[in-house]
């Protein structure tokens, strides 16, 4: 037999079908010019020592072969003995290691078989009524095609599907969309209406994310508040990466899951902007305020479920940083200014009440006063911190109040509102004999003691009603008892107690009269 002809004999190798999974596959045959034809195929498995034979059976029942050697492509003319105007069936037999491996057959009319291209270039992917829609430009001069797709997940083999006939400048396909796993798709085309025409090669992989992006499994930790009033939010655990099918590993455009961090600053609700969305890779610094943090996963089909955490407020307090002066016109707060042109947010809420009851006020941008202090004043009529109770005050500062991540905590402290000097007056002062020249004075704790850091000390005053001599005794804010000694029997005394704050002297309690009885010996 001549090499250019199809040889009408049995091929020159023993007859031994391997039934192996490897071997020749994806045979495609088509006309490449007016009188020339080409068949090509793929071979899976080790290629050393493999000889390929293109087999052909004609409608008459005669069968022949072309010897292709180690090549997986073979050209022949319309004079090679293969009928090109009638239906023929072709397949490849590969002889290797004393066994024959056979490809699936293709049955076609060679003359009418045109080489079709797979979808080339950009394949657009969208979601349509719970399904996947793929769309692409029809390759030039190839309108009229049958289209198939195959798809697989990381854990499943290829499954074949049909896109149906296409007859336009753009072609499309509806495919199944998986809820929770990524998929790899490939498409192929063949001439429409040409019986047995060969399929094109498979297209490049189209990588498609699951309909639901994976829920982010991450953990955060928050560092201690630094000297600058900010604390860093750090990611303890990276989000798990989506498992990808084989052809999508490495560079897989389309399957990307983007994780975004959504910050919601709960404190200081009177500021302009309460939420900010950032890339997860860019971990922000936060003030000491309370925040809700959500990690939102999204892919090309939109956002998925999010995971939310609450970051509580930093409750570390600065007992002396805030000065408060109460005058007839109202109240003014002073604190060390941060920098030039700072906006401050002053937030207060009654202690022991829900965080939702916080009130706040935003200052206009202000520069430090000559003493380097920033101030905030309010009148009694405003009702701010007007009730006689303990308030928790936090002051935040920002040079760019519209940027959520640029706030810092200036200070947190407690303040007793209303008329603190009167409200803090100790009650239930009682005197008990202690010895021949001393008494024990007790009182109920001042309301100021409910406000951490506010009560600086108690002062106990003792007045000798005879000599009008007065002595004052400072008492630690944690104590509610003192012993007065050096007293004389038979003399009338009055005792009073007051509660002082760092910036305010308290009001004396009602005078309590007492005397030590003269002891008469028998």
């Amino acid at each position: 037999c001549r090499t250019s002809e199809c040889c009408f004999q049995d091929p020159p190798y023993p007859d031994a079908d391997s039934g192996s999974a490897s071997g020749p596959r994806d045979l495609r045959c088509y006309r490449i010019s007016s009188d020339r034809y080409e068949c090509s195929w793929q071979y899976e498995g080790p290629t050393a020592g493999v000889s390929h034979f293109l087999r052909c059976c004609l409608s008459s029942g005669r069968c022949c072969y072309f010897a292709a050697g180690s090549a997986t492509r073979l050209q022949f003319s319309d004079q090679a003995g293969v009928s090109v105007l009638y239906t023929v069936t072709l397949w490849v037999e590969s002889w290797a290691r004393n066994q024959t491996e056979k490809s699936p057959e293709v049955t076609l009319q060679l003359y009418n078989s045109v080489k079709y291209e797979p979808p080339l270039g950009d394949i657009k992917v969208s979601k349509l009524a719970g399904q996947l829609r793929m769309e692409w430009e029809t390759p030039d001069n190839q309108v009229g095609a049958e289209v198939q797709f195959r798809h697989r997940t990381p854990s499943s083999p290829w499954k074949l599907g049909d896109c149906g006939p296409q007859d336009d400048d753009t072609e499309s396909c509806l495919c199944p969309l998986e809820m929770n796993v990524a998929q790899e798709f490939q498409l192929r085309r063949r001439q429409l209406g040409s019986q047995g025409s060969s399929w094109s090669k498979w297209s490049s992989p189209v990588c498609v994310p699951p309909e639901n992006p994976p829920q982010p499994q991450v953990r955060f930790s928050v560092e201690q508040l630094g000297q600058d009033g900010r604390r860093r939010l750090t990611l303890k655990e990276q989000p798990t990466q989506l498992e990808l099918p084989e052809g999508c590993q490495g560079l897989a455009p389309g399957t990307e899951v983007t994780y975004r961090l959504q910050l919601h600053m709960l404190s200081c609700p009177c500021k302009a902007k309460a939420t900010r969305t950032l890339h997860l890779g860019k971990m922000p610094y936060l003030s000491g305020a309370a925040y809700n943090v959500a990690v939102i996963s999204s892919n090309q089909f939109g956002p998925g479920l999010n995971q939310t955490w609450h970051i509580p407020a930093d409750t570390h307090t600065e007992p002396v940083a805030l000065n408060i002066s109460v005058g007839t016109n109202g109240t003014t707060m002073y604190w060390p200014a941060r920098a030039q042109s700072m906006t401050y947010c002053i937030e207060w809420q009654p202690v022991g009440q829900d965080g939702g009851l916080a009130t706040c006020s935003l200052t206009a941008p202000q520069d430090p006063d000559p003493a380097g202090m920033a101030t905030y004043s309010w009148s009694r009529e405003s009702g701010a911190m007007g009730q006689e109770k303990c308030y928790y005050i936090t002051i935040f500062a920002s040079a760019h109040p519209e940027k959520l991540t640029l706030w810092s905590t200036v200070l947190s402290t407690y303040h007793f509102g209303g008329n603190a000097s009167a409200a803090g007056t100790p009650h239930h002062v009682s005197v008990k004999n202690h010895s021949l020249d001393s008494v024990s004075v007790d009182w109920a704790p001042s309301l100021l003691s409910t406000c951490p850091g506010v009560l600086k000390e108690y002062v106990v005053r003792c007045r000798d009603e005879d000599s009008k001599q007065v002595s004052e005794h400072p008492v630690q804010p944690t104590e509610t008892q003192v012993t007065l000694s050096g007293l004389r029997a038979g003399v009338a005394y009055t005792v009073q107690v007051r509660a002082d704050t760092a910036w305010l002297r308290g009001v004396w309690s009602q005078p309590q009269r007492f005397s030590i009885e003269v002891q008469v010996s028998d």
């Epitope: 009408f8 049995d10 007859d15 079908d17 008459s60 029942g61 005669r62 069968c63 037999e93 056979k102």
Partner: nanobody
Framework: QLQLVESGGGLVQPGGSLRLSCAAS????????MSWVRQAPGKGLEWVSY????????TYVDFVKGRFTISRDNAKNMLYLQMNSLKPEDTAVYYC???????RGQGTQVTVEP
């Protein structure tokens, strides 16, 4: 000289089965691939199936795959075609063919009708 004689045809209902046989003589049967072809009324020849000399390789046209099975017994010089799930469109004269030189027998008629 080379001779091929087909038998086993007949009338069968749709969904039924037939087994065609082809007795070969006048050549070394075990050295050649063999085919079955058919010719429906008013149509040209149509190749149906092929089997290699040793029987290790079998091939079918798409529209009979899964329904027809080609086999051979080289000791008896016999070629067979087992036809299951027959359809009206399988109605034709079936010929066995020497795949190398195209020689064929006189054929056997298969008719599939309700």
């Amino acid at each position: 000289q080379l001779q091929l004689v087909e038998s086993g045809g007949g009338l069968v209902q749709p969904g039924g089965s037939l087994r065609l046989s082809c007795a070969a003589s006048g050549f070394t049967f075990s050295s050649y691939g063999m085919s079955w072809v058919r010719q429906a009324p008013g149509k040209g020849l149509e190749w149906v199936s092929y089997i290699s000399a040793g029987g290790g390789t079998t091939t079918y046209v798409d529209f009979v795959k899964g329904r027809f099975t080609i086999s051979r017994d080289n000791a008896k010089n016999m070629l067979y075609l087992q036809m299951n799930s027959l359809k009206p469109e399988d109605t034709a004269v079936y010929y066995c063919v020497h795949a190398a030189d195209g020689s064929r027998g006189q054929g056997t008629q298969v008719t599939v009708e309700p």
